[in-house]
């Protein structure tokens, strides 16, 4: 019994005069804007996006919107076309949704914020944006009160008119409309495809948060990883950083390239490599391989408990007003607008701490 290293878990609620507001990362579920896909993009990435078959032709489809089909047929006319160099990172950056177009309004603690307060971050969803990233020398924002008026409130246009037509199932096209959101510590990168939650257009979604600080014990009392990050890419250890690190190694090993959201200096995967190797390999790693990426728990981590609720937007009463305000049709407003409210429930944090049962 002397050699049993037992621990106990202590729960505590700690009142705070202020709390650091978390980083909020959001991604449009559509990866590429239809209007930004050029002839050269279509030539190189058309098959990856299931817009072309392997003979560079538009597949025989009865599902196509006439206007979109007409535009694509024009772009897919490759007679006498000289392909130019193509880079997936540049494509994601240029054709991904722009926060300046999506963000209709932004307030933090009642003060106006703007697209400039969102930092571009690449994830498996492509070009995404983080509010309050704490990077580029910007201070981490604080909040002094709980409740909706003391957090982040944004109104977004998801731009469904820009969604790529879906003529096949690929990892780069989405059946859904909306955004994916992750609320996370500034000390860890977003891992939004695995850990994010969905927010739908036509709703105002309220996310009430509670900060939880978890303190684990290292071996032999517990199983946390006390060492600093052994990584070329991340400064501090987190399960997310470890998994991204590991997924990157796995792809480089299997495909000799990396996806655009992955760190490092391996070449970016080409559209062919995405289709033939990177997408299936990463899907396999995430879904099937239980051993390659075993990431230990860090000894200290901050997570955010969340409670979500939602109401309809627009109401019948406000539909005409919003349509006029944003110079869109009522139908457009109903299909594209969402409001997201993220706030602390109360100004305290919860500590969940493993302690040695006896010294």
């Amino acid at each position: 019994y002397y050699f049993c290293y037992h621990h106990v878990t202590k729960l505590d609620e700690v009142a705070a005069s202020q709390l650091t507001f978390p980083a909020v990362t959001l991604c449009n579920l559509n990866e590429f804007r239809f209007s930004q896909v050029s002839k050269n993009d279509l030539y190189h990435a058309g098959e990856l996006l299931a817009l072309l078959n392997n003979r560079y032709e538009i597949p025989d489809t009865q599902m196509a919107d006439e206007k979109q089909l007409e535009i694509l047929q024009d772009k897919a006319n490759f007679r006498s076309f000289k392909p130019k160099p193509f880079n997936m990172r540049e494509f994601y950056d240029r054709a991904g949704h722009d926060i300046r177009d999506m963000l209709l309004s932004c307030h933090f603690r009642g003060e106006a914020c703007s697209a400039e307060d969102f930092k571009v971050v690449f994830t498996r969803y492509g070009k995404c944006y983080t509010f309050n990233s704490g990077q580029d020398g910007r201070p981490r924002l604080k909040t002094m009160k709980g409740g909706t008026g003391n957090g982040l409130e944004i109104m977004l246009d998801i731009q469904q008119d820009e969604y790529l037509p879906v003529w096949g199932e690929t990892d780069e096209t989405s059946f859904e409309a909306g955004i994916k959101v992750q609320i996370h510590s500034q000390d860890e990168p977003p891992f939004i495809d695995q850990l994010g939650f969905g927010v739908a257009p036509g709703f105002q979604t309220f996310v009430s948060c509670q900060e939880q600080r978890l303190i684990y014990l290292p071996s032999p009392w517990g199983t946390c990883n006390a060492v600093t990050m052994d990584s070329d890419f991340f400064d501090s250890y987190s399960i997310t950083a470890c998994r991204i690190d590991c997924e990157t190694r796995y792809l480089v090993e299997n495909c000799n390239c990396r996806m655009v959201h992955m760190p490092g200096d391996a070449p970016y995967c080409t559209p062919e490599q995405y289709k033939e190797c990177a997408d299936p390999a990463l899907d396999f790693l995430v879904e099937k391989d239980q051993e390659y990426c075993v990431c230990e728990m860090p000894c200290n981590l901050t997570r955010y408990g969340k409670e979500l609720s939602m109401v309809k937007i627009p109401s019948k009463a406000s539909a005409k007003y919003l349509a006029k305000k944003f110079n869109k049709s009522e139908q457009y407003i109903g299909e594209n607008i969402l409001v997201l409210d993220i706030f602390f429930e109360v100004l305290n944090y919860e500590t969940i701490e493993q302690k040695k049962a006896y010294e």
Epitope: E253, A281, D283
Partner: antibody, heavy 116, light 107 residues
Framework: EVQLLASGGGLVQPGGSLRLSCAAS????????MSWVRQAPGKGLEWVSG????????YYADSVKGRFTISRDNSKNTLYLQMNSLRAEDTAAYYC?????????WGQGIRVTVSS | DIQMTQSPSTLSASVGDRVTITCRAS??????LAWYQQKPGKAPKLLIY???NLESGVPSRFSGSGSGTEFTLTISSLQPDDFATYYC?????????FGQGTKLEIK
């Protein structure tokens, strides 16, 4: 080039034992699960056994459970299949394969004949 | 264990024909299905992985589709070299299982 080279087949009497080996090259062997697949003369393909990259987890088809043991030596980049209590119905060509998002490559196939 | 049912067992066709082989899983295997071609005395050759991905070097007349429990392998225009036995395999979960095979022969 990613390659698998199997060896160790032959003729053995019913109730006897045999150990198959599969030497891997061209990839980080310890990162990948591996499997053995067999094919009896004139019959279809049958998965026999699988092992995780570290060797911690092993899996078997019901037809060989308790008689066959899969193992690996990551320092030697080699996969093994220890076959005990062999039966006539174990007569087959045995293939090793690298598991991943696609099972590629496969070894060349080793003939095992169980006959008195 | 997941059962894989392949049909037909034998298929007679002519050069130039379009042929389809189907594979049905007894429970959902997502898209973790592969198709192999095998000729007598040879190791199986991978054609399609993850239900619809064409293996490098395999002619584009081969294509795969499906997800969940229903899958198909299509050869758009049969060539003399395509007469062989074809197997589907699920690699969604242990025990991994193969279909019983489809022998494609000259009509």
């Amino acid at each position: 080039e990613v390659q698998l080279l199997a060896s160790g087949g032959g003729l053995v009497q019913p109730g006897g034992s045999l150990r198959l080996s599969c030497a891997a090259s061209g990839f980080t062997f310890s990162s990948f699960a591996m499997s053995w697949v067999r094919q009896a003369p004139g019959k279809g393909l049958e998965w026999v056994s699988g092992i995780s990259g570290s060797g911690v987890s092993t899996y078997y088809a019901d037809s060989v459970k308790g008689r066959f043991t899969i193992s690996r030596d990551n320092s030697k980049n080699t996969l093994y299949l220890q076959m005990n209590s062999l039966r006539a119905e174990d007569t087959a060509a045995y293939y090793c394969a690298k598991e991943a998002y696609k099972w590629q490559p496969w070894g060349q196939g080793i003939r095992v004949t169980v006959s008195s | 264990d997941i059962q894989m049912t392949q049909s037909p067992s034998t298929l007679s066709a002519s050069v130039g024909d379009r042929v389809t082989i189907t594979c049905r899983a007894s429970q959902s295997i997502s898209s973790w299905l592969a198709w192999y071609q095998q000729k007598p005395g040879k190791a199986p050759k991978l054609l399609i992985y993850k239900a619809s991905n064409l293996e490098s070097g395999v002619p584009s007349r081969f294509s795969g589709s499906g997800s969940g429990t229903e899958f198909t392998l299509t050869i758009s225009s049969l060539q003399p070299d395509d007469f062989a036995t074809y197997y589907c395999q699920q690699y969604n979960s242990y025990s991994y299982t193969f279909g019983q095979g489809t022998k494609l022969e000259i009509k």
